[in-house]
Interface confidence: low
């Protein structure tokens, strides 16, 4: 390509006319601000192509870049595009006008940028200032481009003096944008709502300043659009939130809500979804089984737990024998209901150092305005067995009796055993069980009583021995689910003068 005059910079007079010519081996064209101004194209006999651009009645607004380029679709090499810069000094034009987007300069990293304030006269002195400052900034100026350097996030203006008149440019705004890979989180005020209640969802993006949110939701598919609201969380830098609010939800609003976020600078995107359930009315549902009979051991602590689902959040009350329970100041009872997920709850009744009086009929009731559930069980306090008395007597009938009395809950079993060889028993010889065969020449009589007040069983068992011819170690063992207790007595024949 051959351009005449060759430039690369020309200074032309205002109101004058000037001709630019470009020629090449293929069709050529002049371009100005990405447009093709009116020009004359021709082809010479030698096959050379040319284009002539005639600039008439020049003004300062003709100042700028002019390009000559090949007018075809082949890929152009850099030397197949010629640039010419023309100045038309014009005292009536201060700074050349900018497109609106040129006044806003966005950065995604610290890099050199150009503030494109340009004048028509290459002889003018141009200075750069912060918008509210008088001090000229030490930044190099290129009359064809503007001020180039690394700039803070501020507003800037350029100044020059034309004749005796000081001229200011438009303000240029530099913004350093925070851009990173997109990480979207979606949450809802509630994922379960009743019809008529509001659905409110939030989609939050961290680390970006310029993003576009797009929601998809069940209502959208039926053409009923909801306008989301976008805001910046001021207490957390670079947190942008889009809020989708659907007032007065309907059953058809149940479904998947998706937030899609795109960031235009690096063309990243991410999306997250959340399921919303709209229910006709609230509910309370028990989860899992709790047996109708529960046990606690005397003087030990016991926690009774009920798991349930509910929406809206319910009130939970515990009752014992139809009386309301509350956290006791003495710390004997503790009640707590925990929200383990949005609609799942665990309610616990803890009995600290269980007492006999705490046996009884317990009920947990969970309720709200739409629904109620209750669960009842009987609490039995288990008491380890104690042998309270083991005594031997020999009535006139000539037989000898041994009486064993003990208590416990649940009902204790009684086991009688005897050992005839006192020296070797019970370490070397196992004791013999009594009362369940005739060869022992013994009879057994057992009575069981339930003591309502103490809520435990009393067992009284009498062992009758027909004849005892030598000392006998008799052992009474009481056993139940929570323990055992043993006592023994030595029974001696009538004829012997002593007893142990």
């Amino acid at each position: 390509l051959v351009v005449t005059p060759p430039g690369p910079e020309l200074v032309l007079n205002v109101s004058s006319t000037f001709v630019l010519t470009c020629s090449g081996s293929a069709p050529v064209v002049w371009e100005r601000m990405s447009q093709e101004p009116p020009q004359e194209m021709a082809k010479a006999q030698d096959g050379t192509f040319s284009s002539v651009l005639t600039l008439t009645n020049l003004t300062g607004l003709d100042t700028g870049e002019y390009f000559c380029t090949h007018n075809d679709s082949r890929g152009l090499e850099t030397d197949e595009r010629k640039r010419l810069y023309i100045f038309v000094p014009d005292p009536t034009v201060g700074f050349l006008p900018n497109d609106a987007e040129e006044l806003f300069i966005f950065l995604t990293e610290i890099t050199e940028i150009t503030i494109p304030c340009r004048v028509t006269d290459p002889q003018l002195v141009v200075t750069l200032h912060e918008k509210k400052g008088d001090v000229a900034l030490p930044v190099p100026y290129d009359h064809q481009r503007g001020f180039s350097g690394i700039f803070e996030d501020r507003s800037y203006i350029c100044k020059t003096t034309i004749g005796d008149r000081e001229v200011d440019s438009d303000a240029y705004y530099v913004y350093r944008l925070q851009v990173s890979s997109i990480n979207v989180s979606v949450n809802a005020v509630q994922t379960v709502v009743r019809q008529g209640e509001n659905i409110t969802l939030m989609c939050i993006v961290i680390g970006n300043e310029v993003v576009n949110f797009e929601w998809t939701y069940p209502r959208k598919e039926s053409g009923r659009l909801v306008e989301p609201v976008t805001d910046f969380l001021l207490d957390m830098p670079y947190h942008i939130r889009s809020i989708l609010h659907i007032p007065s939800a309907e059953l058809e609003d149940s479904g998947t809500y998706t937030c899609n976020v795109t960031e235009s600078v690096n063309d990243h995107q991410d999306e997250k979804a959340i399921n919303i359930t709209v229910v006709e009315s609230g509910y309370v549902r028990l989860l899992g089984e709790v047996g109708t009979l529960q046990f606690a051991e005397l003087h030990r602590s016991r926690t009774l737990q009920v798991v349930f689902e509910a929406y809206p959040p319910p009130t939970v009350l515990w009752f014992k024998d139809n009386r309301t329970l509350g956290d006791s100041s003495a710390g004997e009872i503790a009640l707590s209901t925990r929200n383990v997920s949005e609609t799942r709850y665990v309610s616990e009744l803890t009995l600290v150092r269980v007492k006999v009086a705490e046996a009884g009929h317990y009920t947990m009731r969970a309720f709200h305005e739409d629904a109620e559930v209750q669960l009842s069980f009987q609490l039995q306090i288990n008491v380890p067995v104690r042998v309270l008395e083991l005594s031997e007597s020999h009535p006139d009938s000539g037989e000898q009796t041994v009486r064993c009395r003990g208590r416990g809950m649940p009902q204790p079993n009684i086991i009688w055993s005897a050992c005839r060889d006192l020296k070797r028993c019970p370490r070397e010889l196992p004791p013999t069980l009594l009362g369940n065969s005739s060869e022992e020449e013994s009879q057994l009589e057992t009575n069981v009583t339930y003591w309502e007040e103490e809520q435990e069983f009393e067992v009284v068992s009498t062992l009758r021995l027909q004849h005892v011819d030598r000392p006998l170690s008799v052992r009474c063992t009481l056993r139940n689910a929570v323990g055992q207790d043993t006592q023994e007595v030595i029974v001696v024949p009538h004829s012997l003068p002593f007893k142990v």
Epitope: V189, T200, P312, P313, P314, T315, V316, S336, T337, R338, N339, F367, H368, E369
Partner: nanobody, 122 residues
Framework: EVQLVESGGGLVQAGGSLRLSCAAS????????MGWFRQTPGKEREFVAA????????HYADSVKGRFTISRDHAENAVFLQMNSLKPEDTAVYYC???????????????WGQGTQVTVSS
């Protein structure tokens, strides 16, 4: 219908203390979180403190940490805000709020009281 009623506000000297109370009533009151917000004329309502019903978790605004303490009374369905070392900038209308999320955002709270005025003079 749930009602929240605040009390305990008043005029106090800088450096002094006040204890605000909020009583909740209503058949189905079951919010698991109660909190306090405050508002000065022309400004947005600002989070102060909140606590779960179990009082296992509490959260405070940075501006009141170490000076204010939130507590609850289960039997009375009440929440309290003990305010010590009060400063003139604590002057505001204090609102009691109840909801199910331990959060600093207003929309997380379903129920609100009418507010009680606290004025701290220098």
């Amino acid at each position: 219908e749930v009602q929240l009623v605040e009390s305990g506000g008043g005029l106090v000297q800088a450096g002094g203390s006040l204890r605000l109370s909020c009583a909740a009533s209503g058949r189905s009151f079951s919010s698991s979180v109660m909190g306090w917000f405050r508002q000065t004329p022309g400004k947005e309502r600002e989070f102060v403190a909140a606590t779960r019903w179990t009082a296992a978790s509490t959260h405070y605004a940075d501006s009141v940490k170490g000076r204010f303490t939130i507590s609850r009374d289960h039997a009375e369905n009440a929440v309290f805000l003990q305010m010590n070392s009060l400063k003139p900038e604590d002057t505001a209308v204090y609102y009691c709020a109840a909801g199910n999320y331990l959060d600093t955002a207003q929309y997380r709270y379903n129920y609100w009281g009418q507010g009680t005025q606290v004025t701290v003079s220098s």
